[in-house]
Interface confidence: low
């Protein structure tokens, strides 16, 4: 009778992660008596995958009933394949021996490659906000994919970005890979509603790329512009001075009125007007009883935005000679207006 041959018909098999891999093996004879075993890798460090004679291998099932005497099919199926299962698998016939079974003949091997999808891209922005015209960095990470070939693109509001650097690790062979990319984005005043998108294309995604997004609203701080003006009043002895705080983001804002350098009132912005670009406007005003002042008054609108250093704008309120003559003992009054144009005061 011809000497037993171990036939592994497929040189390679490619399987998607999570699926089962069938590794085919057939013998040409039942002689010599002894078990077959499947190993991953060759040499002294090879890993036992399945042992016909004994063992408990939860992920491995035999394609045929190996206990049948006339069975020559020793193919196995490995369930729930992960990238860690990649490698070359050998079907090996052993001759029954003492004290150990003796290797008789090995198949040529079947290389199992695993196609693993990249994880959903995670995009993260800068730890601190930056102002328009500054450049901020966004990172995009995805892990666990195989094979190594992968494409990553960055977009801002649908427009592809070019200023980015991408690394795929590790550089050498591995069961799975990770990608890390950093994009540099120049902020503009209109970026409150903007998004950056990291798009990953991989063979496992069948043309449907994965996307991760980040909102520039988390990265941008648009400082307010201040304008202090005096509004006309019917009453001769009252002045209405407004502070228009415009185009700021994010919301957090505290406004302090000062009269000749002395704090008159502090307010926290609450009811804001949102602009189309996502920035906010707010108006505060001060009613000044001009009879209470003998001299001209410098009114300062001081704004602290998003924990930053305060910015201010001043306005010189002139007191007429007539008011100076009649105002020596009239008490000073600063009050909120009863109605609130443009959202009013808080």
């Amino acid at each position: 009778e011809d000497e037993l041959q171990v036939i592994q018909p497929e040189k390679s098999v490619s399987v998607a992660a999570g699926e089962s891999a069938t590794l085919r093996c057939a013998m040409t004879s039942l002689i010599p008596v002894g078990p077959i075993m499947w190993f991953r890798g060759a040499g002294a460090g090879r890993e036992l995958i399945y042992n016909q004679k004994e063992g408990h291998f939860p992920r491995v099932t035999t394609v045929s009933e190996l206990t049948k005497r006339n069975n020559l099919d020793f193919s196995i199926s490995i369930s729930n394949i992960t990238p860690a299962d990649a490698g070359t698998y050998y079907c090996v016939k052993f001759r029954k021996g003492s004290p150990d079974d003796v290797e008789f003949k090995s198949g040529a091997g079947t290389e199992l490659s695993v196609r693993a999808k990249p994880s959903a891209p995670v995009v993260s922005g800068p730890a601190v906000r930056a102002t328009p015209e500054h450049t901020v960095s966004f990172t995009c990470e995805s892990h666990g994919f195989s094979p190594r070939d992968i494409t990553l693109k960055w977009f801002k509001n649908g427009n592809e970005l070019s200023d980015f650097q991408t690394n795929v690790d590790p550089a050498g062979d591995s069961v799975s890979y990770s990608i890390h990319s950093t994009a540099r984005v120049v902020l503009t005043r209109g970026d409150v509603h903007s998004q950056v998108i990291c798009e990953i294309a991989h063979i496992t995604l069948q043309g449907d790329p994965l996307r991760g997004t980040a909102n520039l609203s988390e990265a941008i701080r648009v400082p307010p512009t201040l304008e202090v003006t005096q509004q006309p009043m019917r009453a001769e002895n009252q002045a209405n001075v407004t502070c228009q705080v415009s185009n700021f983001y994010p919301r957090g804002l505290q406004l302090t009125w000062l009269e000749n350098g002395n704090v008159s009132r502090t307010e926290t912005a609450s009811t804001l007007i949102e602009n189309k670009d996502g920035t906010y406007n707010w108006m505060s005003w001060l009613l000044v009883n001009t009879c209470a002042h003998r001299d001209d008054v410098v009114l300062t609108c001081q704004v602290e935005h998003d924990g930053q250093q305060a910015v201010s704008k001043s306005y010189a309120l002139e007191i007429s000679a007539h008011q100076k003559e009649h105002g020596s003992d009239i008490t000073h009054e600063a009050a909120l207006a009863p109605t609130a144009p443009l959202g009013g005061s808080g």
Partner: antibody, heavy 118, light 107 residues
Framework: EVQLVESGGGLVQPGGSLRLSCAAS????????MHWVRQATGKGLEWVSA???????YYTGSVKGRFTISRENAKNSLYLQMNSLRAGDTAVYYC????????????WGQGTMVTVSS | DIQMTQSPSSLSASVGDRVTITCRAS??????LAWFQQKPGKAPKSLIY???SLHSGVPSKFSGSGSGTDFTLTISSLQPEDFATYYC?????????FGQGTKLEIK
């Protein structure tokens, strides 16, 4: 020498908790499937729980949701966290090593006694 | 769960006797069957795995056979140290289950 030494047993009231430990020596615990088996006084053996080399865990029906098996590779130790203990959990608890490829039990610890009583 | 049934529950024998204990599984367990010996106040000792393979250090007077659902443990020539309780166990699938035990006593 390959050895398993259990500890942590004792007297606990019903509803209480206990954590059993099993210190392995002479082999790397993480390379083997590990088990807990118990034996009530005068009764037979009952398999309780197992943890595979990949960290997969298994439990007998009566302890599911109450017991948690775990291992700490750095300490080469196996643990069994037992919560909501009942009188029926009173037994000697053995730590057992499974065979490299077939998971047949080969090495047993000396056991630790757990008594659940008010 | 797979039920394991041992017979007999107890057995009296003399030194030098050959004894056989049987174990039946409620379903096919291939050859994933183990035998253990336990003496009073001691931890069990592993004797046999995969129905017929002896653990290291176990004397050859112990032998196991069977596959599928029916298995036997044979002790060829009883010695005083062999009087103990013997358990079979299936380990083909979780939860692993033991037989109720066979107590081997001196006649």
């Amino acid at each position: 020498e390959v050895q398993l030494v259990e500890s942590g047993g004792g007297l606990v009231q019903p509803g209480g908790s206990l954590r059993l430990s099993c210190a392995a020596s002479g082999f790397t615990l993480s390379s083997y499937d590990m088990h807990w088996v118990r034996q009530a006084t005068g009764k037979g053996l009952e398999w309780v729980s197992a943890i595979g080399t990949a960290g997969d865990t298994y439990y007998t029906g009566s302890v599911k949701g109450r017991f948690t098996i775990s291992r700490e590779n750095a300490k080469n130790s196996l643990y069994l966290q037992m919560n909501s203990l009942r009188a029926g959990d009173t037994a000697v608890y053995y730590c057992v090593r499974g065979g490299v490829w077939d998971d047949a039990f080969d090495i047993w610890g000396q056991g630790t006694m757990v008594t659940v009583s008010s | 769960d797979i039920q394991m049934t041992q017979s007999p529950s107890s057995l009296s024998a003399s030194v030098g006797d050959r004894v056989t204990i049987t174990c039946r599984a409620s379903q096919d367990i291939n050859n994933y069957l183990a035998w253990f010996q336990q003496k009073p106040g001691k931890a069990p000792k592993s004797l046999i795995y995969t129905a017929s393979s002896l653990h290291s250090g176990v004397p050859s007077k112990f032998s196991g056979s069977g596959s599928g659902t029916d298995f036997t443990l044979t002790i060829s020539s009883l010695q005083p140290e062999d009087f103990a309780t013997y358990y079979c166990q299936q380990y083909v699938s979780y939860p692993y289950t033991f037989g109720q035990g066979t107590k081997l006593e001196i006649k």
